[in-house]
Structure formats: C-alpha cells, structure tokens
Amino acid sequence: KESCDVQLYIKRQSEHSILAGDPFELECPVKYCANRPHVTWCKLNGTTCVKLEDRQTSWKEEKNISFFILHFEPVLPNDNGSYRCSANFQSNLIESHSTTLYVTDVKSASERPSKDEMASRPWLLY
C-alpha cells in the first residue's frame, strides 16, 4: 500500500549548471493523494532558507506526479545558490533536499563551459 504522505522528489545534492540570460525552470516534483498541498520555494542563506515571495511560479500536472515550478526569466548572476521547496500538509511542513544552481555569466555560445567544467568549479557558488 502506497503512503499517502506528501513526497517532494528533489534528489539529494542535485546540481544544475545554467547560463545567465537564459530562461530556466526549477522543478519540485510533488506526489500527493487527494488535495494538492501548498508548496513554496526558498533560497538558502547560510542555514536559513529565505522564502521567495515575489517570484513567478506555476504548476504542471502529469498523470502520477505534479511539478511546482520556479521560473527564472531570465537567469541572473545572483540566482546562483541553493534552493529548497516545502509543502504544508496536514499542518506538517515537509522540506525537500536542496538543489544548487551554478550560474555562469553570459558568454558567447562557443565559450560556454561544459557541465564537466562547471562541476569542477563549486566555488562559483560563493
């Protein structure tokens, strides 16, 4: 029997390399049984996660799962950092693992760093 708890499917220590100026959608996959929970995004600042109030978000519904999407239109350099989604379910707060965005400043397409190059530069986060 499947659990009817809300589940947030962001992988632990997941990472994305993205380019400033591009659009990007950060997805929080949400599994629930009956009523869709209230979901929010926050950005980590040290050990505190600061709620993102005035950002464009949307829901995408699929057969077995829903996605709460944080839109970056476009990505800005200060979007660099770690994000977490949270769901309120039966007065419980369920938090996802954090996911990290590494933002590279705009370059010509030929100079875009590869994912391999990005992965070797976690200092971009700071």
Partner: antibody
C-alpha cells in the same frame, strides 16, 4: 530488481583511449546517481566521480579530474566512463554503481570491467 | 577531502566469534539534513563490492541481522555478532556526506 551490466574486459596499448559502459535496469535512472570506482590490482577502492543522469551534471574526485570523462544517455539507461591517454598505471578493475538519489535506499554495483594497459 | 581510517587492517577470528571493525573520519560526517552518510561494503575475492549498511546503521535488503553498524560524528563501527564462514572478506567504510566521496583502506577479515 535494480541491476547493472558493464561492458567486457579490454586490453589497450599506452596512449590509446577507451570508453566503457554500464547499463541499468529495474529503475528509472533519472531518479538515481551513477558513479564509477577504480580498484587497482590488490588494492582498495577509489571513487572516480558520479553523474546525475537526469541532467548530465558530473562530479569528479580531484585525483581523476581531467583524466576521465563520465557521461550518460538516460534514454538507454546507460552511463559511460572514458579514459584517455592510457598508461600502464590505469590497469585496474573499474566498477560502476547506482544509488537512489532521494533516500539512498539502494546501492547496486556492476560486475566490473577489467582494463589492462600494456605495450 | 575527508580521510577515513579503518582499523585493524587485518582481523583474524574464528567462526562463531564476534568481529568489530572501526572507521574513523577526519571530520564529522553529519550532513546539514541531520543525517550521517556513512556506509559499509563487503567485497569477496573476485566479486564486486556489495553495500551492507547505509546511514550508519540501516541494513540493506537481504543482509543478515548479525551485521550491525553504529557510531556518530567521526567514529563508526561495523560489528558481526557471530562470524559465519561466508563472512570472510574485505570490508570498507565510505562516506557520502561530502565530495569527493572517499573510502577507508579496507579491513580483511580472515579465518583464525
């Protein structure tokens, strides 16, 4: 049941390149991380790096950075390890493994690929 | 990078005896999510490694309950309560808290 099957043993000459594969089944690999480990003859285990098959993002051990390339094709549930400019010291057993990205509830290893580099 | 130091390097026991292997980390393995990502692997000659224990003390499916893991922070222990003939192998601890992932150097469990 989660399973990994690696490509067969390889014998190469110094300076050559090699790409070994690791095919997963029994799981949606977008929900996992896949990683590679080296074991030189009679020695311990060394973590090479990992890939997130969902987006191709890689992490390498500093010891292997620039020497190897990890890639994946999620459409065929397969991860790859490319070794370039092979040296005799690259002779080893190379293992791939896969684990659950959310809860680490499973961690399954392939059977290993023996790579021999000899002139 | 995190250094994991296992002791002893070789452990000689007779079947039926208790075996205890230690793994010490150069820094805490407690992650920001409150979990400790310390695993134990078993490797038999000519075979691939197999995970026995994850998150310090959780046994993998099919792992006999004579295997147990304990510890916190920087000090961890794998205990085999009564060693069976099929348990003679090399055991590795490894951490999944920080990058790069690192392994202990291994402990060979041999027949006394």
């Amino acid at each position: 049941e989660v399973q990994l099957v690696q490509s067969g043993a390889e014998v190469k000459k110094p300076g050559e390149s090699l790409k070994i594969s690791c095919k997963g089944s029994g799981v949606n690999i977008k929900d996992t991380y896949m990683y590679w480990v080296r074991q030189m003859p009679g020695k311990g285990l060394e973590w090479i790096g990992r890939i997130d098959p969902a987006n191709g993002y890689t992490r390498y051990s500093p010891s292997f950075q620039g020497q190897v390339t990890i890639s994946a094709d999620k459409s065929i549930s397969t991860a790859y390890l490319q070794l370039s400019s092979l040296k005799a010291s690259d002779t080893a057993m190379y293992y791939c493994a896969v684990y659950d990205g959310y809860y680490e509830s499973f961690d399954v290893w392939g059977q290993g690929t023996l790579v021999t580099v000899s002139s | 990078e995190i250094v994991l130091t296992q002791s002893p390097g070789t452990l000689s026991v007779s079947p039926g005896e208790r075996a205890t292997i230690s793994c010490r980390s150069s820094q805490s393995l407690l992650d920001s999510d409150g979990k400790t990502y310390l695993n134990w692997l078993q490797q038999k000659p000519g075979q691939a490694p197999r995970r026995l224990i994850y998150l310090v003390s959780k046994r993998d499916t099919g792992v006999p309950d004579r295997f147990s893991g304990s510890g916190s922070g920087t000090d961890f222990t794998l205990t085999i309560s009564r060693v069976e003939p099929e348990d003679f192998a090399v055991y590795y601890c490894w951490q999944g808290t920080l990058f790069p992932r690192t392994f202990g150097q291994g402990t060979k469990l041999e027949i006394k």
